[in-house]
């Protein structure tokens, strides 16, 4: 399987909420013998490899923000630690995996990475990641709502997040 990032760039006004999304593509095993570990972290855009550096999101590490669930389950972080920092990560049945950040500030701007580890018990392990950029803007040039830009270079149309 692979990880797709539907949007490569999110441009949001200060104070807004945003949900960053990754999506699992390809044959995703939903059987009982599969466990997924998923998490989010901040990084920097390296010359060779993005997402190699793992930095916290609002002081929460990728360990703090991780989800784990079986192939047939959905999951979300309901623990107080994440919510106290205005964060929640979630995963649904359809391969969508997201992190919601509330009350954005300029300090939230940067590169965000999702990491997925698929463990097929008695068989294998596979890990993949995706990256996207968040720009938080303030002042008269800031959009009134978050604007998202599709990852596909063919689709240059902007989509305003609901």
């Amino acid at each position: 399987f692979k990880v797709a990032t539907p949007y490569s760039l999110y441009v949001c006004p200060e104070g807004q909420n945003v949900t960053l999304t990754c999506r699992l593509l390809g044959p995703v095993d939903k059987g009982h013998d599969v466990t997924f570990y998923k998490t989010w972290y901040r990084s920097s855009r390296g010359e060779v490899q993005t997402c190699s550096e793992r930095r916290p999101i609002r002081n929460l590490t990728f360990q703090d923000l991780h989800l784990h669930h079986g192939g047939h389950q959905a999951a979300n972080t309901s623990h107080d630690l994440a919510q106290r920092h205005g964060l929640e990560s979630a995963s649904d049945h359809h391969g969508n995996f997201s992190i919601t950040m509330r009350n954005l500030t300029l300090l939230d701007s940067g590169l965000y990475c999702c990491l997925v580890v698929e463990i097929r018990h008695h068989h294998s392990e596979h890990r993949v990641h995706g990256a996207m950029e968040l720009q938080v803007q303030t002042g008269k040039d800031a959009p009134s709502n978050c604007v998202v830009y599709p990852s596909s270079s063919q689709d240059s149309e902007n989509i305003t997040a609901a």
Epitope: D33, T35, Y37, T39, G46, Q49, C51, S52, E53, R54, F62, Q63, H66, H68, L115, V117, I119, H121, H122, S124, E125, H126, R127, V128, H129
Partner: antibody, heavy 120, light 106 residues
Amino acid sequence: QLQLQESGPGLVKPSETLSLTCIVSGGSISSSGYYWGWIRQPPGKGLEWIGSIFYSGNTHYNPSLKSRVTIPVDTSKNQFSLKLSSVTAADSAVYYCARRDILTGPFDYWGQGTLVTVSS
Amino acid sequence: DIQMTQSPSSLSASVGDRVTITCQASQDITNYLTWYQQKPGNAPKLLIYDASNLETGVPSRFSGSGSGTDFTFTINSLQPEDVATYFCQQYHNLPTFGGGTKVEIK
């Protein structure tokens, strides 16, 4: 501070089963974010991953050893084991137990290793 | 299985020299590669993960780089205490190790 300690016989006869135990202290083996594994190193040679067990009891084994390896876990004693059947002299090695963080990837904590010699 | 080919198998360098070790994967492993240091009689010690991230407490003279199939481990200024064998390991899939590089002082 997490510590892992291997124990078991230092001498095993050919064709018998090698049995080692790894006692984990300073952390719970039931933690969901970790694999607990065995790696071996023949004298003067490189490292070979043998297999790992997940907190739930599910396992991954090195395909080349799969038919001979079992890694049971005993969460009540906070320990896991290695059983390697039908041993030969080629199985003589220092055996390490180690922990792998699933999200980070590498083996981040290791036992000090125990030398097992296969000889009659 | 993903095969890891490490070279050289041994090297000898002077104190202060820059030492480079390479590791090649048989298929693309993104950046899911780690480097360990093993001193005689000891267990391996984690130095670098995700190809280039220095583990906490590891001296900054150690560094790693690379992506895909080709990776490099560098000791910027070799010190006497760096005499050891260094191993790479991939964790893109089930773990496999490189054959090791023994580093000695001239």
